[in-house]
Interface confidence: low
């Protein structure tokens, strides 16, 4: 499938609109600090060049790789050294090292201002005045803040964003129509970004084999009627798509994703009965729909797994002949029978099975050695079941905010060296597992909860990797992808931690807290809670609850006062003194 000009090939496959959007996303994900206008200029130059190659594939430079073309273009940015420091050194390298260098400098937590949502009238005016610029800005702002966002999926978000403005800017009550849609897109966008970040971490930190194992398990749960060979083909294609997107090859990724969606829809009879509606949709919606499609029903009368994987005299022979294929078949067979298990649990079971065969197939009596392997699965299955049961009970008792607070305290005691904003962000997200998953029946709770927790803990891992401060976090993040959650769950209070010096400034609040949204006010209070635990890691739940209740009462009182600022100053001093006394600071 060699093309004389790769850039012409992708331009023709994707069309001008998608080509330009994907190049803008790629550039914004690499150079996250560059102004919008600079990126638009670069994208327009690349697009004009691509058009010359479409006209004549033999034209000068049209035979260059996309990495070469894009890298050369990025390296023309005049302020590269001043804005990005050592990233400018990437430009001295040759491909493929230059692209690898750019990838290593992607920043998961770029120092960018929080996106402030203007009033609806202002947004609608901007949308009507220049729709193209308005939508490009959306792509740019999301891409630079989420440098691993799944690019073809971002095109789908942009399409929905455009549809929301098209509909709502004509509505009688523009705000009532638009704001809920924008909130939904924001929340879904954050979730999509975090899920993709885990896929990229899986590929980049643990390799293709780890990603393929994840994909076998997930696709086998989703398509339990599909043959193993069919699942294997889908896994290979899906791995290629995500490897490309995670590697910054966004044009190839989007093109291959479209091909995969086409293949799935052409072969849905041998894949899943749930794909019909998805396959009737336009391309971007189709791909999104397939990615989110519900699990198909399990085939009736599936035989016992033990026959092929424990009782058969050929287990070691089959394993020795093609280890990964045999383990893949085990994972496929187990996963299709267990939509009620999380993917990470299925992978733990497969790992246990692999370890057992490695040991037993070298033993004097292999069958005797591995005969009880399925018994080893029981505690692995029960551990997440019990954890989810306990935490859902706690969530139902406390509600989301207080459940988040319980997790904040728990995680701050485990890893107090982690920065307060990271602890707050991660614990708030961990706490959302309650409202997301505890409402589900038993059969759906574990895949919902544990696979969601994997996504959130990956956020902790990538943020911590940027500025490592805790050996315990590094250990849990790097030792095993599938055991991250059990590793963090098993951490006790860090007894080696030296409590933070008390700083009254940390607990000084002002009247501006009164004008914050409920969510922002919660974050302020949760930030204070983390700081309290860092000062007094041995504080009991009861002590912390008393201080937080006092704090909530203090905020409520001063926000109702006529002279708010004076109230915050005077009552704040009293609160700090009372808290110090209550916690023995």
């Amino acid at each position: 499938d060699a093309h004389k000009s790769e850039v012409a090939h992708r331009f023709k496959d994707l069309g001008e609109e998608n080509f330009k959007a994907l190049v803008l996303i790629a550039f914004a994900q690499y150079l996250q600090q560059c102004p919008f206008e600079d990126h638009v200029k670069l994208v327009n130059e690349v697009t004009e060049f691509a058009k010359t190659c479409v006209a004549d594939e033999s034209a000068e430079n049209c035979d260059k790789s996309l990495h070469t073309l894009f890298g050369d273009k990025l390296c023309t940015v005049a302020t590269l050294r001043e804005t990005y420091g050592e990233m400018a050194d990437c430009c001295a390298k040759q491909e493929p090292e230059r692209n690898e260098c750019f990838l290593q400098h992607k920043d998961d937590n770029p120092n960018l201002p929080r996106l402030v949502r203007p009033e609806v009238d202002v947004m609608c005016t901007a949308f009507h005045d220049n729709e193209e610029t308005f939508l490009k800005k959306y792509l740019y702002e999301i891409a630079r803040r989420h440098p691993y966002f799944y690019a073809p999926e971002l095109l789908f978000f942009a399409k929905r964003y455009k549809a929301a403005f098209t509909e709502c800017c004509q509505a009688a009550d523009k705000a009532a129509c638009l704001l809920p849609k924008l909130d939904e897109l924001r929340d879904e966008g954050k979730a999509s970004s975090a899920k993709q970040r885990l896929k990229c971490a899986s590929l980049q930190k643990f390799g293709e084999r780890a990603f393929k194992a994840w994909a076998v398990a997930r696709l086998s749960q989703r398509f339990p009627k599909a043959e193993f060979a069919e699942v294997s083909k889908l896994v290979t294609d899906l791995t290629k798509v995500h490897t490309e997107c995670c590697h910054g090859d966004l044009l190839e990724c989007a093109d291959d994703r479209a091909d995969l969606a086409k293949y799935i829809c052409e072969n849905q009879d041998s894949i899943s009965s749930k794909l019909k509606e998805c396959c009737e949709k336009p391309l971007l919606e189709k791909s999104h729909c397939i990615a989110e499609v519900e699990n198909d029903e399990m085939p009736a009368d599936l035989p016992s797994l033990a026959a092929d994987f424990v009782e058969s005299k050929d287990v070691c022979k089959n394993y020795a002949e093609a280890k990964d294929v045999f383990l893949g078949m085990f994972l496929y067979e187990y996963a299709r029978r267990h939509p009620d298990y999380s993917v990470v649990l299925l992978l733990r079971l497969a790992k246990t099975y692999e370890t057992t065969l490695e040991k037993c197939c070298a033993a004097a009596d292999p069958h005797e050695c591995y005969a009880k392997v399925f018994d080893e699965f029981k505690p692995l299955v029960e551990e997440p079941q019990n954890l989810i049961k306990q935490n859902c009970e706690l969530f139902e008792q406390l509600g989301e905010y207080k459940f988040q607070n319980a997790l904040l305290v728990r995680y701050t005691k485990k890893v107090p060296q982690v920065s307060t904003p990271t602890l707050v962000e991660v614990s708030r997200n961990l706490g959302k597992v309650g409202s997301k998953c505890c409402k589900h029946p038993e059969a759906k709770r574990m895949p919902c909860a544990e696979d969601y927790l994997s996504v959130v803990l990956n956020q902790l891992c990538v943020l911590h990797e940027k500025t490592p401060v805790s050996d315990r976090v590094t250990k849990c993040c790097t030792e095993s992808l599938v055991n991250r959650r059990p590793c963090f769950s098993a951490l006790e209070v860090d007894e080696t931690y030296v409590p933070k010096e008390f700083n009254a400034e940390t607990f000084t609040f002002h009247a501006d807290i009164c004008t914050l949204s409920e969510k922002e006010r919660q974050i302020k209070k949760q930030t204070a809670l983390v700081e309290l635990v860092k000062h007094k890691p041995k504080a009991t739940k009861e002590q912390l609850k008393a201080v937080m209740d006092d704090f909530a009462a203090f905020v409520e009182k001063c926000c109702k006062a006529d002279d708010k600022e004076t109230c915050f100053a005077e009552e704040g001093k009293k609160l700090v003194a009372a808290s110090q006394a209550a916690l023995g600071l």
Partner: nanobody
Framework: QVQLVESGGGLVQPGGSLRLSCAAS????????MSWVRQAPAKGPERVSA????????IYADSVKGRFTISRDNAKNTLYLQMNSLKPEDTAVYYC??????????PGQGTQVTVSS
């Protein structure tokens, strides 16, 4: 840190003109819509005018339409409000804000505009 520094206010007679400026720093000015908000004594804040990031869209309160003009210079990180045909009811502290919030975005003190004969 976001900084917004308003200037250009003062005492002016009814029918007179003033030009307010707002110097912005600490964020990428050219990427945000901006607004002018005013607060008269014993009254809540009122959005006077807003402008999109690339100046393509502007909005005015009914009370100032035809008299006030909002503009911006992204190269200079500055927002402007040209106020003509001023009336006593325009007397207020004027703030600039990011987006079109009526809550001041930075620690700016605002600039006092007094219209009186």
């Amino acid at each position: 840190q976001v900084q917004l520094v308003e200037s250009g206010g003062g005492l002016v007679q009814p029918g007179g003109s003033l030009r307010l400026s707002c110097a912005a720093s600490g964020f990428t000015f050219g990427q945000f819509g901006m607004s002018w908000v005013r607060q008269a004594p014993a009254k809540g804040p009122e959005r006077v005018s807003a402008i999109s990031s690339d100046s393509s869209g502007t909005i005015y309160a009914d009370s100032v339409k035809g008299r006030f003009t909002i503009s911006r210079d992204n190269a200079k990180n500055t927002l402007y409000l040209q106020m003509n045909s001023l009336k006593p009811e325009d007397t207020a502290v004027y703030y600039c804000t990011i987006g079109s919030s009526t809550t001041p975005s930075g620690p700016g003190q605002g600039t006092q505009v007094t219209v009186s004969s």
